[in-house]
């Protein structure tokens, strides 16, 4: 799987999970989240050559097309596969609220 | 939706459905498909600026992060959303066979 266990231990130019820490205030301008101050969001990036973690029949066809027509602009793209939520603490007035924000952390990637 | 109805009628640099005709023989090296000779596979391409058809909370966060940190390499990518099958005719010896190949045609796109 193109997850942390694989991607963070290997130098990989192809589609893989990449580490990305996001500071809510600095990187997003969000001041309303009290805790955490930031989180490991991660992201997906890298080339999608033929048969590399292809998601669908179309992405396989597209990567094969791209192999035969390398000058073409049509090629699969490296995107998130499995995502996890992030639990945050914020305040409404003086009342603390705990909420789970869905699909905030990328755990693995695919070529789609 | 970033589908043919919208994308094929508008000049759009952002993520959108793009027309792509694939000739089975020429583009994939597949000689076994008798009919059709090719098909409109389409593909997804274009920029994914903040809030442009974001698929998940993570892709929204990433596009906002990219707006504030434009030099960063982390950004969402334009990929297929809805896919449809393609019906093909091929032969086993002299016997014609009809088969449906799943997920062969992209109908719409998203930023993921």
């Amino acid at each position: 799987a193109l997850d942390a266990a694989y991607c963070f231990r290997n130098v990989q130019d192809n589609c893989c999970l990449r580490p990305l820490y996001i500071d809510f205030k600095r990187d997003l301008g969000w001041k309303w989240i009290h805790e955490p101050k930031g989180y490991n969001a991660n992201f997906c990036a890298g080339a999608c050559p033929y048969l590399w973690s292809s998601d669908t029949q179309h992405s396989r066809v597209l990567s094969l097309y791209n192999t035969i027509n390398p000058e073409a602009s049509a090629s699969p793209c490296c995107v998130s596969q499995d995502l996890e939520p992030l639990t945050i603490l914020y305040y409404i007035g003086k009342t603390p609220k705990i909420e789970q924000l869905s699909n905030m952390i990328v755990k693995s990637c695919k070529c789609s | 939706a970033l589908d043919a109805a919208y994308c094929f009628r508008n000049v759009q640099d952002n993520c959108c459905l793009r027309p792509l005709y694939i000739d089975f023989k020429r583009d994939l090296g597949w000689k076994w498909i008798h009919e059709p000779k090719g098909y409109n596979a389409n593909f997804c391409a274009g920029a994914c600026p903040y809030l442009w058809s974001s698929d998940t909370q993570h892709s929204r966060v990433l596009s906002l992060y990219n707006t504030i940190n434009p030099e960063a390499s982390a950004s969402p990518c334009c990929v297929s959303q809805d896919l449809e099958p393609l019906t093909i005719l091929y032969y086993i010896g002299k016997t014609p066979k009809i088969e449906q190949l799943s997920n062969m045609i992209v109908k719409s796109c998203k930023c993921s």
């Epitope: 192809n14 048969l51 | 597949w30």
Partner: antibody, heavy 118, light 107 residues
């Protein structure tokens, strides 16, 4: 039903040539690649190479490049594996297998045992 | 040259779960396929595309991937599952590579 039928066992002397065959039936022969796999006595599987019968494009494992030739005749739905000069170390079971472009072998031949001995 | 590493042998008690691993540098991206070979027979595909099962293969057989390791899991192991199991995948040049094989013994 899908079948890959291989030619019978062969006993040869070192230096002799040999061509073994694999006939596909029950499917569109040019839709799938045909791969060849070697299994030496008591050992594991080794991929030798494959051919796309539709285009005659071949790809060989570096270990077998120049040692064997893979070919196909799509008119009779048959793939071939041949040696121009056999060695004792070529003694093995050879399997052909049907392979989609996406990479797995879904049907296998029954195997051809090649014995090379002086 | 690129290698896929499997344990030489795995033992499992009848009715229990057997896990056979396969590790290699590219297994994160190129999916592993698994083959079963019984003595004197040709190999049979049991898992393809990392976790898909061909028709006729029991649901007891499943595949998964984590990091650079692919795992074949056989639940409720039966005597008839005794065989050699091979993983296969690609190196970065799209050359097919087989693992060395694992002999499964059902006790």
């Amino acid at each position: 039903q899908v079948q890959l039928v291989q030619s019978g066992a062969e006993v040869k002397k070192p230096g002799e040539s040999l061509k073994i065959s694999c006939k596909g039936s029950g499917y569109s022969f040019t839709r799938y690649y045909v791969a060849w796999v070697r299994q030496m006595p008591g050992k594991g599987l080794e991929w030798m190479g494959w051919i796309d019968p539709g285009t005659s494009n071949t790809r060989y494992s570096p270990s077998f490049q120049g040692q064997v030739t893979i070919s196909a005749d799509k008119s009779i739905s048959t793939a071939y594996l041949q040696w121009s000069s056999l060695k004792a170390s070529d003694t093995a079971m050879y399997y052909c297998a049907r392979m989609l472009a996406w990479g797995w072998f879904d049907y296998w031949g029954q195997g051809t045992l090649v014995t090379v001995s002086s | 040259s690129y290698e896929l590493t499997q344990p030489l042998s795995v033992s499992v008690a009848l009715g229990q779960t057997a896990r056979i691993t396969c590790s290699g540098d590219n297994l994160g991206g190129y999916y592993a396929h698994w083959y079963q070979q019984k003595p004197g027979q040709a190999p049979v595909l049991v898992i393809y595309d990392k976790s898909d099962r061909p028709s006729g293969i029991p649901e007891r057989f499943s595949g998964s991937n984590s990091g650079n390791t692919a795992t074949l899991t056989i639940s409720r192991a039966q005597a008839g599952d005794e065989a050699d199991y091979y993983c296969a995948s690609y190196d970065s040049s799209l050359m097919m590579v087989f693992g060395g094989g694992t002999k499964l013994t059902v006790l």
